[in-house]
Interface confidence: low
């Protein structure tokens, strides 16, 4: 983009400040609350917009089980630590000095402790399953449709390449959806299953972080498929470490 | 549809410059990469080089820096491809093509009809 | 720069064949190769993606295999209209390169 273009935005990403004060006048984004240049030609990493959000004003066809070291994001929001390439630093503290470890998404993966607390590397999720409940319709949907529009949106909105999408399993109303990528299956430029999940999320809920495109309007053969909940489980390449009183 | 249209035909002088367009619709132009390619005649496919839409940063192959410059203009959803100091030899059809960002997705889903450049004394 | 070899360079086959195309790169391309089809005076069109992904709309006697070095491009029956120039390329690494081009003719 260039100084005389009006139209500096992040399509990516609208939780950013956008000027053209880039190379030769370029126009270039700044996500809010760490003001860091982002590439709006891809999606933004979860922890910058994790960060944003907290700096903004508030207002075969059977399921998968979940393993047993399956995490699920039951902390919630937090204010975290990025590194200089957008990624969750591997250990996150809050204002009162406790600390845990987190995975490559940003979830919790140790119990809490001080200061004291050694994270020794960043651990990769490399495997998502987001289970989905669609509301009730007239039939079940047809698996194949829903498998094709589900890896289409995952490649067309998201930008994730197919090969990363690993199934999409059904059984009315349960849909759910594996990501799967190993660190070295990651190509540079690949979009990682953690942002695509994230931002797949925040759509289904209604609070797309895309720049002045409409909501997220799934449509199987023109059927609506409109969702009530959303669980998402994380699996990381090196199981988590609890304590037993967590798992009780 | 999805749709890339390039500006017509060019017979250019030895030394001149050209500049083809390459005007898309069917999609968010800064959501995808163009690239551009050539092909002599009865030749290969060679590629020159390609633009990060959303970022309007350039990348060129070696065998054409310094003589060619590849931009953008996202308000007419158009890029364009201007080669300089011609010579006989870049007699070639030019296309524009449609691809990702990423390593993973720089292959090309849709191209454009393509545009002969003659270069002739 | 990557190289790209394509084999054979030229081929006749009849309709209702099986035909394999073969590109091997110089280096190490993971599963980064695109397949296009060619016919004269025209643009060339994508056939498969990422070594085995059939683009929308390809026939599915278009097929592509392979990892690292070697690839294929395999039409298990060949119709009339299969009959052009078949181009590999690697989008692994910029430069991006092609294979020189293989003609598929008439028997």
């Known amino acids: 983009h260039t100084a005389a273009q009006d139209n500096c935005t992040c399509p990516t990403n609208k939780m950013t400040v956008c000027s053209p004060d880039g190379p030769g006048g370029r126009c270039q984004c700044r996500a809010l609350g760490s003001g860091m240049a982002v590439d709006c030609s891809t999606l933004t990493s979860k922890c910058l917009l994790l960060k944003a959000r907290m700096s903004a004003p508030k207002n075969a066809r059977t399921l998968v089980r979940p393993s047993e070291h399956a995490l699920v994001d039951n902390d919630g929001l937090y204010d975290p630590d990025c590194d200089p390439e957008g990624r969750f630093k591997a250990r996150q503290c809050n204002q009162t000095s406790v600390c845990w470890c987190v995975n490559s998404v940003g979830v919790r993966r140790t119990d809490k402790g001080d200061l004291s607390l050694r994270c020794d590397e960043l651990v990769r999720t490399h495997h998502i399953l987001i289970d989905l409940r669609h509301r009730p319709t007239a039939g079940a949907f047809n698996h194949s449709d829903l498998d094709a529009e589900l890896r289409r949106l995952f490649r067309e909105r998201y930008r994730l390449h197919p090969k990363f999408v690993a199934a999409v399993h059904y059984e009315q109303p349960t849909i759910q959806i594996e990501l799967r990528q190993n660190t070295s299956q990651k190509a540079a430029g690949d979009v990682d299953i953690g942002d695509a999940a994230y931002y797949f999320e925040r759509d289904i809920k209604g609070e797309s972080l895309f720049q002045g495109r409409g909501g997220l309007d799934l449509r199987v053969r023109g059927e609506p498929l409109q969702v009530e909940r959303t669980l998402i489980y994380y699996l990381d390449e090196i199981p988590p470490k609890f304590s037993m009183k967590r798992l009780t | 549809q999805v749709q890339l249209v390039q500006s017509g035909a060019e017979v250019k002088k030895p030394g001149a410059s050209v500049k083809v367009s390459c005007k898309a619709s069917?999609?968010?132009?800064?959501?995808?990469?163009m690239q551009w390619v050539r092909q002599a005649p009865g030749q290969g496919l060679e590629w020159m080089g390609w633009?990060?839409?959303?970022?309007?940063?350039?990348k060129y192959a070696e065998d054409f820096k310094g003589r060619v410059t590849i931009s953008a203009d996202t308000s007419t959803s158009t890029a364009y491809l201007q080669l300089s100091s011609l010579k006989s030899e870049d007699t070639a059809v030019y296309y524009c093509?449609?691809?990702?960002?990423?390593?993973?997705?720089?292959?090309?889903?849709?191209w454009g009809q393509g545009t002969l450049v003659t270069v002739s004394s | 720069d990557i190289q790209m070899t394509q084999s054979p360079s030229s081929l006749s086959a009849s309709v209702g064949d099986r035909v394999t195309i073969t590109c091997k790169a110089s280096?190490?391309?993971?599963?980064?190769v695109a397949w296009y089809q060619q016919k004269p005076g025209k643009a060339p069109k994508l056939l498969i993606y990422?070594?085995?992904y059939r683009y929308t709309g390809v026939p599915s006697r278009f097929s592509g295999s392979g990892s690292g070095t070697d690839f294929t491009l395999t039409i298990s029956s060949l119709q009339p209209e299969d009959f052009a120039v078949y181009y590999c390329?690697?989008?692994?690494?910029?430069?991006?390169?092609f294979g020189q081009g293989t003609k598929l003719e008439i028997k």
């Open positions: 093509a449609r691809s990702g960002f990423g390593s993973s997705y720089w292959y090309f889903d849709v």
């Open positions: 069917g999609y968010t132009f800064t959501t995808a990469g």
């Open positions: 633009i990060n839409t959303a970022s309007g940063v350039p």
């Open positions: 280096q190490d391309v993971s599963t980064a």
């Open positions: 990422s070594a085995s």
């Open positions: 390329q690697q989008h692994y690494i910029t430069p991006l390169t």
